[in-house]
Structure formats: structure tokens, C-alpha cells
Interface confidence: low
């Protein structure tokens, strides 16, 4: 669609005569009729296929025509067309005399025609005017013409329709050739696709307006490049959504089971060596001088009663020291300067001479021991504590410190391994002689029922349009990650574009 514009500039009719040669009275009041049609090698009668237009009276005899409205007419004259401009044309311009104000044919005299010109040729669409001048015997007409495209039409033939827009159907302006030029932040054939925030992940992110980055289910972060781990994942990470890959030293479905209690909690005190022995379980190997589950108890070296013959033991920083009774000497008061005559045997012990009286030996009654029967029998020497329990003398009595899993006076009772509910996900615990066994409910397996083996929700391929399926382990459901252009819980709906564009 376009307009053929004809600008009449000057008409010369110096003698003021008609085509017949007869003079106009009092002068030739001149108006024009124009016919525009398809190219003809010889311009001949026939329909004005591209249109016709006429002017009011523009002047008398010889006159110049103003560039604007003149007496109600328009200059340039407009001949609109609503087809592809063919690039060629034929043009007929007739000058007529109007004796009165009535330009209807019935009001004109028989020979009212002043002059007629006919041209034909090529004409490309463009802003530049072509100037022409046609001269006959009695008249001269100077005019210019051009073809321009109508609003919203572009291209060499005014055949490309393009209307700038900034709405749901597109965000663009039009280039001189009619091609679209997307507004900043938009792309695609019709500039409908927003350009997301720079770096926004192609698959995991999307946007509905420029410089935005909205994350698809299972992804997070400014650029949607960080996966969301399984809900409740404590000490784990993911590489795809809803995973929970445990960090070093952690286990279980939610990576909340401590498999490296030693490193994470450092329970052993006083320089003891820690050894992991299962979930939240450990063993401390104490340095000399310490005892207790966590080696938190400082051992007195005098607890083992190292001083003999009634010597008294004194704890020191670097060990102990024996204070010997009269008649004894040595590190442990083990050497005697006494004989039976000195009654060296305590607690009713019997003295026997040895080596012709140079030495002696005490025979102790029950419950006493030592070279002078000075010591009560150590109740721990017979290892009364079962199952690796540690025996501690406490004055006149003794006690057993039991290893984890055992109890009772002598650590003889086996603590039920099932007491701390070790079976996950509702598993049933069975005590065995050397440990425990879990019977797991449907959908779980592993030593502690910690491994989920339920049916994969994605196995039935519920997602449409090549979407990626993820199983949500906490709910046994699936999540569909839609490709660009699709929405819905199964990615089954295309993003709503109209079936045809309104331009």
C-alpha cells in the first residue's frame, strides 16, 4: 500500500486559449484531472487502474501552484493504491477550463479541454521527487511526482506491512526495509522472547521479561545454576535437584547420621586416640595415667598400691613416691632390714625365718597380701569385670566401668542394641548375640533401613514435551522441569501464543 504523489508547480497558457484554439472569456479558469494506471507502451484509453483525482480551479491562464492546500484542493495530489507498487506506470494529466464554479461535466462547454499530457515509465519507491515539464504548442506544465509507502508499509514495492508494537505479540520497531528491529531486551522472529539476565541457565532458568531469571522447580540462585537438595538434607549436597549426596563422614537418607564422630566432636580427652566404631559410636584409647570412656579421668598411680611392706604412696607429677616404714627401703619398700624377731608380719600373718635368719617371709591370712601382709587383697586382680569392663578399686569396695553395650555390677548384662531404636523408617529391631538386625518395611533396605528403594515415580515417563523428570524422595512424587515454551505440572501446555498474528 502506498501513495503516488503529483505536485503541480506551474502552468503556462500565455494566450489563454483552449485546445481548439478558441480563447477563454475572459480567461482560462483552469482545473486539472489526473489518471494513473498500469504501464502501457503507448498510453491509450482504458480504466485508470491505479486511480483518478481532480483539482478545484487553481488559477487563470498562467499561474504557479502553491505547495499546500489551494482553494480546497491538495497539492501535492494524492493517488493512493492498496497493492504492491509494480515499479512502472502511465500518467495522464488534463487541464480544463471552468467558465463558472460548477465543475460538473454538464456545466462545461463542449470544448472546455485546454491541454492533455500523457507519460509513462519506471518509478521506484522513494522520497525524492522527479521533476518533469511537458510543453505543447500553446501550453507548458511543470510538475514533479514520486511514490511513497503508506504508514506501516515498507520495502521496494511497499509490500511489507510492519507496525511497531510493544505488547504481548511483539516488542519491535520497523527498519526501512520492513524487517523487525527488536527493542532492547527482546529477541526471536517477532521479538516476543525476552532476553533473560546474563548468565541465566538455559535449561534451569527462564524469564517473562528482560533481565529476569526465574528458576524452574528444583533450582535456585541468582542464575538458577544451583540445585535444591532433598528437603531435610543436613550434611549433603546435590548435582541434580532433590539429591542428597552426603559429605565425608555423614550417612543416611538425609546425611544426618554421623559416621565420623571422632572428627566432628573430638570426644576423647587428654590426648587419647579416638577410633570411629559405627554411627555415633567411638572408642577412646587413653594415654598412661588416664581412664574413663572419654579418658576424662586422671588415674592416680598410687591406685595400684605399688608400695610394699606397709609403705605409703604419694602421687607426684611424674609418677609416685613410696614412704617406707622403719626396717624397709627400696623404690617400692621391697627391701627389708628386719627379721622375725621384729614381728614384721601385719594382720595376723605368720613369720618364717629364711637364710639362717637373715631374711623372713610372711604367710598371710585370707584377704591380705603383700610381703608383710600389709595389703588387703586387690579385688581387681581376678578380673571380675566381664565383657572388657574396667575394674576400679574404691577403698574397701570395687566397681566395674563397663564398655558401651554392657551393664550390671560386673558388666555381665548385655544392653539391648535395640534400645536406641537404630532401625530407620519404622524398621523392626531384633537383638542378636553379636549385635542386632533390622527388618525393613516395604520401600526400604540397608543395614538400618536407611536406603529408600521405593518405585521410581519417574519410571512411567509422566513428563511431556521432552521435559526432565526428577523423583522427590520425601513424597514419592515426581517434578517435571519444563523446556522453554511449555508449562504445567507435566509440561503439557504450550505457552499461550495466538494461532495467527494480527498484523
Amino acid at each position: 500500500s502506498g501513495v503516488f504523489q503529483l505536485q503541480l508547480q506551474e502552468f503556462i497558457n500565455e494566450r489563454g486559449v483552449l485546445a481548439s484554439g478558441r480563447p477563454c472569456e475572459p480567461g482560462c479558469r483552469t482545473f486539472f484531472r489526473v489518471c494513473l494506471k498500469h504501464f502501457q507502451a503507448v498510453v491509450s484509453p482504458g480504466p485508470c487502474t491505479f486511480g483518478t483525482v481532480s483539482t478545484p480551479v487553481l488559477g487563470t491562464n498562467s499561474f504557479a501552484v502553491r505547495d499546500d492546500s489551494s482553494g480546497g484542493g491538495r497539492n501535492p495530489l494524492q493517488l493512493p493504491f492498496n497493492f504492491t507498487w509494480p515499479g512502472t506506470f502511465s500518467l495522464i494529466i488534463e487541464a480544463w477550463h471552468a467558465p463558472g464554479d460548477d465543475l460538473r461535466p454538464e456545466a462545461l462547454p463542449p470544448d472546455a479541454l485546454i491541454s492533455k499530457i500523457a507519460i509513462q515509465g519506471s518509478l521506484a519507491v522513494g522520497q525524492n521527487w522527479l521533476l518533469d515539464e511537458q510543453t505543447s504548442t500553446l501550453t507548458r506544465l511543470r510538475y514533479s511526482y514520486r511514490v511513497i509507502c503508506s504508514d506501516n508499509y515498507y520495502g521496494d514495492n511497499c509490500s511489507r506491512l510492519c507496525k511497531k508494537r510493544n505488547d504481548h505479540f511483539g516488542h519491535y520497531v520497523c527498519q526501512p526495509d520492513g524487517n523487525l528491529s527488536c527493542l532492547p531486551g527482546w529477541t526471536g522472529e517477532y521479538c516476543q522472547q525476552p532476553i533473560c539476565l546474563s548468565g541465566c541457565h538455559e535449561q534451569n532458568g527462564y524469564c517473562s521479561k528482560p533481565a529476569e531469571c526465574l528458576c524452574r522447580p528444583g533450582w535456585q540462585g541468582r542464575l538458577c545454576n544451583e540445585c535444591i537438595p532433598h528437603n531435610g538434607c543436613r550434611h549433603g549436597t546435590c548435582s541434580t535437584p532433590w539429591q542428597c549426596t552426603c559429605d565425608e563422614g555423614w550417612g543416611g537418607l538425609f546425611c544426618d547420621q554421623d559416621l565420623n564422630y571422632c572428627t566432628h566432636h573430638s570426644p576423647c580427652k587428654n590426648g587419647a586416640t579416638c577410633s570411629n566404631s559405627g554411627q555415633r559410636s567411638y572408642t577412646c584409647t587413653c594415654r598412661p595415667g588416664y581412664t574413663g570412656v572419654d579418658c576424662e579421668l586422671e588415674l592416680s598411680e598410687c591406685d595400684s598400691n605399688p608400695c610394699r611392706n606397709g609403705g605409703s604412696c604419694k602421687d607426684q607429677e611424674d609418677g609416685y613416691h613410696c614412704l617406707c616404714p622403719p626396717g624397709y627401703y627400696g623404690l617400692h619398700c621391697e627391701h627389708s632390714t628386719l627379721s622375725c624377731a621384729d614381728s614384721p608380719c601385719f594382720n595376723g600373718g605368720s613369720c618364717r625365718e629364711r637364710n639362717q635368719g637373715a631374711n623372713y617371709a610372711c604367710e598371710c591370712p585370707p584377704n591380705f597380701t603383700g610381703s608383710n601382709c600389709e595389703k588387703k587383697v586387690d579385688r581387681c586382680t581376678s578380673n571380675p569385670c566381664a565383657n572388657g569392663g574396667q575394674c576400679l578399686n574404691r577403698g574397701p569396695s570395687r566397681m566395674c566401668r563397663c564398655r558401651p553395650g554392657f551393664t550390671g555390677t560386673y558388666c555381665e548384662l548385655h544392653v539391648s542394641d535395640c534400645a536406641r531404636n537404630p532401625c530407620a523408617h519404622g524398621g523392626t529391631c531384633h537383638d542378636l548375640e553379636n549385635g542386632l538386625m533390622c527388618t525393613c518395611p516395604a520401600g526400604f533396605s540397608g543395614r538400618r533401613c536407611e536406603v529408600r528403594t521405593s518405585i521410581d515415580a519417574c519410571a512411567s515417563s509422566p513428563c511431556f514435551n521432552r521435559a526432565t523428570c526428577y523423583t522427590d524422595l520425601s513424597t514419592d512424587t515426581f517434578v517435571c522441569n519444563c523446556p522453554y515454551g511449555f508449562v504445567g505440572s507435566r509440561c503439557e501446555f504450550p505457552v499461550g501464543l495466538p494461532p495467527s498474528f494480527p498484523w
Epitope: 484531472r33 489518471c35 494506471k37 491509450s44 484509453p45 482504458g46 480504466p47 485508470c48 483518478t52 481532480s54 495522464i92 488534463e94 460538473r104 461535466p105 454538464e106 462545461l108 462547454p109 463542449p110 470544448d111 472546455a112 479541454l113 492533455k116 500523457a118
Partner: nanobody
Framework: EVQLVESGGGLVQPGGSLRLSCAAS????????LGWFRQAPGKEREWVSC????????YYADSVRGRFTISRDNAKNTVYLQMNRLKPEDTAIYYC?????????????WGQGTQVTVSS
């Protein structure tokens, strides 16, 4: 007031002939181009022929060239259309038309029309 009155239409067998007349009044007849167009039911109007004012140059549509002849009698203010070797596809209402230009055909004024039916 411009008046154009057509006559001469009717029913004719294929291959037959008809002569249409258009009597004009209300304007200076010899100053203007006149012609004929037709319109068949359900179809667009179609130029058939026209004749210029000055030198009597004639124009014919391709579909009728060689079969139809246009002429004018300025003394009688009448234009004629001689139609020979008629075909069924020539069936239509034929209108006489006046153009305000001297040398082209336009639909500035036209008459009431006359029916031409070509059928066996």
C-alpha cells in the same frame, strides 16, 4: 443532470448478436470518454470497452476483443456496443458509463443497466 439510459438487451442463443445503445443527456457529450462495463451475479464488475472523446480511440477487455465493437454518434449523444458471437459467459447486466476525463475510462456516472442473457 447527467442521465444515461441503456437499451437493446435481451435473451439470445450462443453465437448470436445484440446491439446495445446508451442515450446520454445533461452534459456536453463530445467532451467526455464513455464506455461499457458489466456485472454477472456473484462476480466483480468488469470493464468491457470505452471510447475517448477527442479522437475516438477505443479500448476493449481481452475477453471481448474481436467480438465486440464500440462506437459513438456525437450528433445523437449516443454510444453503441455491437456484440457478436455471444457466449454464455457474456451473460450479465451491462451498464453505460461516463468518465469525466476526455481520454480515459472511469466510473464517474453510470446508468440503470440492461440485462443480456446468452442461453440455449
Amino acid at each position: 443532470e447527467v442521465q444515461l439510459v441503456e437499451s437493446g438487451g435481451g435473451l439470445v442463443q450462443p453465437g448470436g448478436s445484440l446491439r446495445l445503445s446508451c442515450a446520454a443527456s445533461g452534459f456536453t457529450f463530445e467532451n467526455y470518454a464513455l464506455g461499457w462495463f458489466r456485472q454477472a451475479p456473484g462476480k466483480e464488475r468488469e470493464w468491457v470497452s470505452c471510447i475517448s472523446s477527442s479522437d475516438g480511440t477505443t479500448y476493449y477487455a481481452d475477453s471481448v476483443r474481436g467480438r465486440f465493437t464500440i462506437s459513438r454518434d456525437n450528433a445523437k449523444n449516443t454510444v453503441y456496443l455491437q456484440m457478436n458471437r455471444l457466449k454464455p459467459e457474456d451473460t450479465a447486466i451491462y451498464y453505460c458509463a461516463l468518465s469525466l476525463g476526455s481520454s480515459w475510462c472511469a466510473y464517474d456516472y453510470w446508468g440503470q443497466g440492461t440485462q443480456v442473457t446468452v442461453s440455449s
